[in-house]
């Protein structure tokens, strides 16, 4: 039975050039999270595994590092890194949880800095 | 080339044991959750046990939970899985397997050691 | 515990056919779903996880598609060396159950 929740930053904005934090967060369950994906579009951009801990996709080495806690931190940003999300939690005994970002890179100052997640 | 070679199975009676081993090369072997699924002779596929990569955490079915366990040696790339009280339906075909990286599916499988239980 | 339904169980085709094989889960399980092809007395084999991702090395006549319980394999043209088992494996939920399969076979 699946009881958790995954709750994340929803929909963001940054601007073009910065960095942002994608974080997700998995409540209301006492599953145990045996690893973490972080894809983009269905491109697997990092793992993050209970034993091993981190591991970057090497095609997105340059511009993404691991965290904070769980999350993953975009550096760099492209108007081509407007987009789809996805943090999947990998639990037992629940099973797989996927949580939704919506990333928009902005051209200008347009981007909110208000952003809980934002890095300045 | 990933290569997965189980041995260790054999004919043993109710209530005994059998440890299978899995030899594992061609990959990083330590970085990879691995299973163990069976097959009843003529039937389908069933999930057994998972470990996690380095061996921290394990995962079973219902039917295996407190007879089975699943352990492996990074050190000699290789996984086991130690059978007590055997049943006449754990009666099967034994693979090995390997996750994705991903750990989406389970990409390489060894070729299998049969277990018969029976008296 | 998700149960997996194939159907059909077996299915009779040529070389040259196409051929669909579908996939029913008991609940949703999003897009956890994977495609495994087993011959007679061999391991099985992966081809298609995430319900439309395809291996490595799979040949492009294989295809899945489907998200929450429909889920399909598509063989666009049956070739000889295509006639075995096939099995879904859902990944949504332990424990992860396979389907009883879908034997094809030579018509």
């Known amino acids: 039975m699946m009881t958790g929740t995954i709750e994340t930053t929803g929909n963001i904005s940054a601007e073009k050039g910065g960095s942002i934090i994608l974080q997700c967060h998995l409540s209301s369950t006492t599953a145990q999270v045996t690893q973490v994906n972080w894809e983009q579009q269905d491109q697997l951009l990092a793992i993050c595994n209970a034993d091993l801990g981190w591991h970057i996709s090497p095609s997105f080495k340059d511009r993404v590092a691991p965290g904070p806690g769980l999350g993953l931190t975009l550096q760099s940003l492209t108007v081509n890194d407007t987009g789809e999300y996805f943090c999947i939690y990998h639990t037992y005994p629940d099973g797989t949880y996927t949580g939704r970002i919506f990333l928009e890179v902005l051209e200008s100052s347009v981007a909110e800095h208000g952003a809980r997640f934002q890095i300045p | 080339e990933v290569q997965l070679v189980e041995s260790g199975g054999g004919l043993v009676q109710p209530g005994g044991s059998l440890r299978l081993s899995c030899a594992a090369s061609g990959f990083t072997f330590s970085s990879y959750i691995m299973s163990w699924v069976r097959q009843a002779p003529g039937k389908g596929l069933e999930w057994v046990s998972t470990?996690?990569?380095?061996?921290?955490?394990?995962y079973y079915a219902d039917s295996v939970k407190g007879r089975f366990t699943i352990s492996r040696d990074n050190s000699k790339n290789t996984l086991y899985l130690q059978m007590n009280s055997l049943r006449a339906e754990d009666t099967a075909v034994y693979y090995c397997a390997k996750w994705l990286l991903s750990y989406y599916a389970m990409d390489y499988w060894g070729q299998g050691t049969l277990v018969t239980v029976s008296s | 515990d998700i149960q997996m339904t194939q159907s059909p169980s077996s299915l009779s085709a040529s070389v040259g056919d196409r051929v669909t094989i579908t996939c029913r889960a008991s609940?949703?399980?999003?897009?956890?779903l994977t495609w495994y092809q087993q011959k007679p007395g061999k391991a099985p084999k992966l081809l298609i996880y995430?319900?439309?991702k395809s291996h490595t090395g799979v040949p492009s006549r294989f295809s899945g598609s489907g998200s929450g319980t429909d889920f399909t394999l598509t063989i666009s043209s049956l070739q000889p060396e295509d006639f075995a088992t096939y099995y879904c494996q859902q990944g949504q939920s332990y424990p992860y159950t396979f389907g009883q399969g879908t034997k094809l076979e030579i018509k």
């Open positions: 995430k319900a439309s």
């Open positions: 470990i996690s990569g380095g061996g921290t955490n394990t």
């Open positions: 609940q949703n399980i999003n897009v956890w």
